[in-house]
């Protein structure tokens, strides 16, 4: 969370955002919030990122602003301006780029004041593992899927009756890349699996965190999957 | 399912204050502005002013000014008009209402105010 | 403070009938107006969001236009309900202001 006071001249208030990732190919949200003020009028939001020439957005007297915005962020940008009165100054990025990452500032003017805050937009590519039983293996074997990693991940794999047990040994990971060239699929294979155990294969980069849960019984198969942006710090 | 319950009628002499409730629920209170409105007799509607519980910030348009005082309980979720020196002028139905997205797509069923002698 | 200026302020028509209400506002406010209808003795109901958007469960015979700062509300197919009063609203700047109103009447 970053907190940001206004400078000098009018009264200063208060710009709030949050740290947050970026799905590549997705729409992401970058978050901003700031004191609510009714006279739409009189709010000015900017969005602007370090090492651009060009404005990512803005929006002023009740309307998007967009003379000034970068060639990079064309058609891509937009605010909730039906929550801008309650303080909503949130951008929403469509279709998110690996080079959109970076430090972007929201910049507020309002009738009250002034603020801002920074922004740390990490990008790559993240998504929900799956966990099946293989029965074309020839023992009882696991296999994770997750179609869509960036940058590499690590998987471990873990068991809740072995717990503390290391399984690299009867693992077997590979990375295949997608045809956009970017992003990877991930396979896990698990062997030598017990039954009546829960297992968890954990797919983990510095953007996000994802788990795949399977218990196998010996009359159901019960599946869970988990994800989890890392680095979600306010400002 | 958003709801504005209102208090109940209201008789007054000339001179005096009251005090009028919106109790609220199905939104969180202290995220939106509430606004009031009036409406006199066979009249148009007429924007008093706001108030947003997060903050107790208000905006007041200038005509009721010194004659309206909004404030908030957010532990009650309800909001709060004070009508101070009432006249004839004031005799009107007054209405609490909210936007979840800026327009006023909930409207409370309104407080008659009847001032006389 | 931003005038909105409505008309007519009554209307006769006949049922299945179409009808255009206007609202001038004084200065831009870009879209940010609204259309309620108000039944007698109720309170007002969100018809029309920022100047032509259709509120949830308002039917299709309700519509809204702008052009600058003109805007319009269209009822296409009168019904014996819509002879009520309508009112647009500007919420760009604050005071927030109404359009003094249109009553709707039966020929």
């Known amino acids: 969370l970053i907190i940001g006071f206004g400078i000098s001249g009018r009264h200063s208030i208060t710009v709030t955002t949050v740290a947050s990732a970026g799905n590549i190919g997705e729409d992401g949200i970058l978050s901003c919030t700031f004191e609510p003020d009714i006279k739409l009028s009189d709010i000015v939001i900017q969005w602007l990122k370090e090492g651009v020439l060009g404005l990512v957005h803005e929006f002023k007297e009740g309307k998007d602003e967009l003379s000034e915005q970068d060639e990079m962020f064309r058609g891509r940008t937009a605010v909730f301006a039906d929550q801008v009165i309650v303080g909503n100054a949130s951008l929403r990025l469509k279709n998110v780029q690996l080079t959109d990452a970076g430090t972007y500032k929201c910049y507020i003017i309002t009738s009250k004041g002034k603020g801002n805050a920074n922004l740390e937009y990490k990008t790559g590519a993240f998504s929900m593992p799956e966990v099946n039983v293989d029965y074309n293996a020839s023992s009882e074997t696991l296999r994770c899927e997750a179609p869509r990693w960036f940058p590499q991940p690590t998987v471990v794999w873990a068991s809740q009756v072995d717990q503390g047990a290391n399984f690299s040994e009867v693992s077997n990971t590979s990375f295949e890349l997608n045809s956009e060239n970017v992003t990877m699929k991930v396979v896990s294979v698990l062997y030598n699996v017990t039954i009546n155990n829960t297992y968890s294969c954990m797919i983990e980069n510095d953007i996000a965190k994802a788990t795949g849960d399977i218990k196998v019984t010996e009359s159901e198969i019960k599946r869970r999957s988990h994800l989890q942006l890392l680095n979600s710090k306010a400002s | 399912e958003v709801q504005l319950q209102q208090s109940g009628t209201v008789l007054a002499r000339p001179g005096a204050s009251v005090e009028m409730s919106c109790k609220t629920s199905g939104y969180t209170f202290t995220g939106y502005w509430m606004h009031w409105v009036k409406q006199r007799p066979g009249q148009g509607l007429e924007w008093i002013g706001t108030?947003?519980?997060?903050?107790?910030?208000?905006n007041y348009n200038q005509k009721f000014k010194g004659k309206a005082k909004l404030t908030a309980v957010t532990s009650a979720n309800t909001a709060y008009m004070d009508l101070s020196s009432l006249s004839n002028d004031d005799s009107a139905v007054y209405y609490c209402?909210?936007?979840?997205?800026?327009?006023?797509?909930?409207w409370g069923q309104g407080t008659l105010v009847t001032v006389s002698a | 403070d931003i005038q909105m200026t409505q008309s007519p302020a009554s209307q006769s028509a006949s049922l299945g009938e179409s009808v255009t209400i206007t609202c001038l506002a004084s200065q831009t406010i870009g879209t940010w107006l609204a259309w309620y209808q108000q039944k007698p003795g109720k309170s007002p109901q969100l018809l029309i969001y920022?100047?032509?958007s259709l509120a949830d469960g308002v039917p299709s015979r309700f519509s809204g236009s702008a052009s600058g700062t003109k805007f319009s509300f269209k009822i296409s197919s009168l019904q014996a309900e819509d002879f009520v009063s309508y009112y647009c609203q500007q919420f760009y700047t604050t005071p927030w202001t109404f359009g003094g109103g249109t009553n709707l009447e039966i020929k």
């Open positions: 209402t909210m936007g979840l997205r800026t327009w006023l797509d909930y």
């Open positions: 108030i947003f519980p997060g903050n107790s910030d208000t």
């Open positions: 920022a100047a032509t």
